[in-house]
């Protein structure tokens, strides 16, 4: 009863440092509460980017100071990460946990490589 999690392999952030991707999971049970965590893996370091727990049928809400926003629809979560800079380029992995009711299930995606390119500063114009 493995839980498969799918996410795109590559995403290019916008010039404003915003990247969006879908994290989809195949639920083996009838969960009413789901936790979605985005982890960033760079070199051998792992950092939690953001996490949200939501009730099925309700919106997922991240903490106010989170750099993530998202919406949910069935077994699909649309994630948006903002405020990204070139140094944030890396592999962003979606971890899904079916929290309630028991049994608990874990699913981890293969990761989305997000490329962030800092915009070139505008040249001074002489008028």
């Amino acid at each position: 009863k493995a839980m498969h999690v799918a996410q795109p392999a590559v995403v290019l952030a916008s010039s404003r440092g915003i990247a969006s991707f879908v994290c989809e999971y195949a639920s083996p049970g009838k969960a009413t509460e789901v936790r979605v965590t985005v982890l960033r893996q760079a070199d051998s370091q792992v950092t939690e980017v953001c996490a949200a727990t939501y009730m099925m049928g309700n919106e997922l809400t991240f903490l106010d100071d989170s750099i993530c926003t998202g919406t949910s629809s069935g077994n699909q979560v649309n994630l948006t990460i903002q405020g990204l800079r070139a140094m944030d380029t890396g592999l962003y992995i979606c971890k899904v946990e079916l929290m309630y009711p028991p049994p608990y299930y874990l699913g981890i995606g293969n990761g989305t490589q997000i490329y962030v390119i800092d915009p070139e500063p505008c040249p001074d114009s002489d008028f």
Epitope: K1, A2, M3, P28, E33, R35, L39, V46, E48, A51, T53, K95, M99, Y100, P102, P103, Y104, Y105, L106, G107, I108
Partner: antibody, heavy 119, light 106 residues
Amino acid sequence: QVQLVESGGGVVQPGRSLRLSCAASGFTFSNYGMNWVRQAPGKGLEWVAVIWYDGRNKHYADSVKGRFTISRDNSKNTLYLQMNSLRAEDTAVYYCARGGDWGPYFDYWGQGTLVTVSS
Amino acid sequence: EIVLTQSPGTLSLSPGERATLSCRASQSVSYLAWYQQKPGQAPRLLIYGASSRATGIPDRFSGSGSGTDFTLTISRLEPEDFAVYYCQQYGSSPWTFGQGTKVEIK
């Protein structure tokens, strides 16, 4: 560095109660699922219970369901295990263990506290 | 619940030899971890996700496998590697451990 220190073990009679504590330090306690794992003398490891993040969700092994209650105080970075209606077969070293970044394996363990249920 | 069966129960080897420990699941397992435990000590995480080494674990320890068959390999046994090794599945609750394999000095 991550540190987990259990306390509260001891000798108790069958049918009585005991509360274990686990003081955590060196990490953001509320970001992790926390577990109790036990080991009877000379035996293998048995997962007992988990409590998630904010403390609302808890799961238990069938062997302790209805008798043991796991709880946490994130303001005190402390994990608890309330053990009621203790039986001789609950005799074990009880370990507090942190869940990992990538799921509920156990990446850090306390030193353990021995609970002996005997008349 | 998923039952994990480890084999052999005891492995008698000499320092410098290669150790191969097996963990077989009663049904397909998504996520598996390996632990080492020495007498009087708490277990120590070696491997998670079937093949990822935990922080500070020497590269002589490696994990492999998927589905129902998993292996922990110690390429060259050091004196400090003689201990009991446990596998654990954590893809779905209840999380279960194998009964352990004791690696002893021959």
